[in-house]
Interface confidence: low
């Protein structure tokens, strides 16, 4: 066992003792979390589509409000949106966010204020003569601008519907276009008005398809689990060759999905980065944490892939088989 774990460690696979090493070769199902595991977990905003009255809510204002709201989110998609908004607005400073609530698997809601400063220090529109610029090279703030507070909702269709908004078929179709490419489409409502759609893409890891194919050729069932909607999940699964998908799974229900498979007599390995999936890593017969994941995940897992390479999932099972064969 010590030799096996030592060899694993030399190859960037940290196996916490003999028990997981002996368990690995019994694994019949590997469940991969999507974001940060099958994908890089570094999402990028691909498109911002304004849906409302652009006179009332021009793009710049929407980005200032959305960037401020998402700055309080720890979700990778929220981080990506805030990064994009800051870059687009040419600022590191955002407004104030209060009454923030995040509903896992659905979206966020909050109140946003103090975005006037961001909008005042915008880049000069082409139509603005240079003589109107202040020393900072930006347009002066409007005099007597009344500070506004915006009520913001950002999330999936279900989240907005739950908050009383109607999503028209053309908006839903625009979202579907992106979801069919494996992108995540989220909606933005400000002060009760649906005003934008943001499409976010997260690239699939280069080795993911090979890792999935190799596991399947070893007789292991491979499952994708994600909080994303079915269309996005299915598109990503197709890219890497996974047939079985659990989509729209709330973080709290990921454990139940692992138990569901265990109750059918299967030995389950759960592979994740710890964002929303630490309890599932702990529940699995073998919890595998990606090394770039959270401290909680690394604590909860039986195996840690230091190199963040999905082929190391395959390697750990191979190593387990060889070690157990030696022991016997």
């Amino acid at each position: 066992v010590m030799v096996g774990t030592g060899v694993a460690a030399q190859n960037g696979i940290l196996i916490k003792g003999g028990k997981p090493l002996e368990m690995a070769h019994k694994i019949k199902t590997v469940m991969f979390d999507k974001t940060g595991t099958i994908t890089h977990g570094v999402p990028r905003v691909m498109r911002v589509l304004l849906l409302g009255d652009v006179a009332t809510l021009p793009l710049r204002k929407v980005l200032a409000v959305v960037g401020t709201a998402e700055a309080s989110s720890e979700h990778p998609l929220g981080v990506a949106v805030t990064k994009y908004c800051k870059e687009e607005l040419g600022t590191e400073t955002l407004g104030y966010c209060t009454d923030f609530q995040a509903v896992p698997g659905c979206g966020i809601g909050c109140k946003v204020s103090n975005v006037e400063g961001i909008l005042a220090h915008s880049e000069r529109p082409l139509s603005a003569p240079a003589s109107h610029l202040n020393e900072a090279g930006s347009l002066p703030a409007e005099k007597d601008a009344v500070p506004q507070t915006f009520s913001v909702l950002i999330g999936n269709r279900e989240w907005l519907r739950r908050n009383g908004l109607t999503i028209s078929s053309d908006v839903s179709d625009a979202m579907t276009d992106h979801e069919m490419k494996g992108q995540t489409a989220i909606l933005v409502a400000i002060d009760g008005v649906l005003c934008g759609m943001i499409a976010i893409a997260d690239a699939v890891k280069q080795e993911a398809a090979l890792a999935v194919h190799t596991l399947q050729s070893m007789g292991v069932d491979v499952v994708l689990i994600t909080g994303d909607n079915r269309k996005t999940a299915r598109a990503i699964a197709t890219q890497v060759g996974i047939n079985k998908v659990f989509a729209e799974v709330l973080p709290s229900h990921k454990v139940a999905k692992v138990q569901e498979l265990q109750n059918k007599g299967k030995k389950v390995a759960m592979v994740g980065d710890g964002v929303n999936d630490s309890p599932a890593l702990a529940q699995a017969d073998m919890g595998v944490a990606i090394g770039t994941g959270t401290d909680v995940a690394i604590e909860a897992a039986d195996v840690v892939l230091i190199r963040n390479d999905l082929l190391d999932v395959v390697a750990s099972i191979h190593l387990s088989k060889r070690t157990v064969r030696r022991i016997r």
Epitope: M46, R47, V48, L49, L50, V54, P58, L59, R60, L63, E87, E88, L89, G90, S122, E123, P125, L126, G137, A174, D177
Partner: antibody, heavy 115, light 110 residues
Framework: SLEESGGRLVTPGGSLTVTCTVS????????IIWVRQAPGEGLEWIGS?????SAYYTSWVKGRFTISKTSTTVDLKMTGLTTEDTATYFC?????????????WGQGTLVTVSS | QVLTQTPSPVSAAVGGTVTINCQSS????????LSWFQQKPGQRPKLLIY???TLASGVPSRFKGSGSGTQFTLTISDVQCDDAATYYC???????????FGGGTEVVVK
């Protein structure tokens, strides 16, 4: 203003870097786009370099072209060149989020790929 | 985003009016992120219209942009010999996976 440089004759399979040098404005406030135009053809977007250095590319680039920037220049590095890459390469300035159009253009630099 | 321009080429008499259409699929960002350029042979493109309808600095008022969402039009009235060029519409580049430029419309002045 913007000025492209570095265009020349290259053999197929070769590499080349063309440079866009800017003056009179800050790259930390604007996007720079690269556009090419094959002889007798239309304008074709290659990619964009953002204020914080992020780069976006068109779908056909497939890793052959890379955009990088310094405080006053934006480079377009091209590898695996083919005769189809023969074109005049332009850089242009694009605004921030409240506008997305290209108000300043360089004069272009000609890249010829031929054996 | 795909921008389709029609017609090409288009001819006009001096003093006449020319209309060039640009159709976007899907709609352009902000419903107005569309610009028009003029390019003469051997020269760099020149911005004429931005924000679908705003005239760029120094551009004669004979050039007029209109439209919103998916349908846009550039109208050149009182056409001059100097207007002979290829005209391009363009959408936003940051949301483009494909080319944000239309295919171009050549205007021939008789």
């Amino acid at each position: 203003s913007l000025e492209e440089s570095g265009g020349r004759l290259v053999t197929p399979g070769g590499s080349l870097t063309v440079t866009c040098t800017v003056s009179g404005f800050s790259l930390s406030s604007y996007w720079i786009i690269w556009v090419r135009q094959a002889p007798g053809e239309g304008l074709e977007w290659i990619g964009s370099s953002g204020p914080s250095g992020s780069a976006y590319y068109t779908s056909w680039v497939k890793g052959r072209f890379t955009i990088s920037k310094t405080s006053t220049t934006v480079d377009l590095k091209m590898t695996g060149l083919t005769t189809e890459d023969t074109a005049t390469y332009f850089c242009a300035r694009a605004g921030g989020s409240d506008y997305d159009w290209f108000d300043l253009w360089g004069q272009g630099t000609l890249v010829t790929v031929s054996s | 985003q795909v921008l389709t321009q029609t017609p090409s080429p288009v001819s006009a008499a001096v003093g006449g009016t020319v209309t060039i259409n640009c159709q976007s699929s899907p709609s352009v960002a902000n419903n107005n992120w569309l610009s028009w350029f003029q390019q003469k042979p051997g020269q760099r493109p020149k911005l004429l219209i931005y924000g679908a309808s705003t005239l760029a600095s120094g551009v004669p008022s004979r050039f007029k942009g209109s439209g919103s969402g998916t349908q846009f039009t550039l109208t050149i009235s009182d056409v001059q010999c100097d207007d002979a060029a290829t005209y391009y519409c363009a959408g936003g580049h940051k949301t483009a996976e494909k080319n944000p430029f239309g295919g171009g419309t050549e205007v021939v002045v008789k």
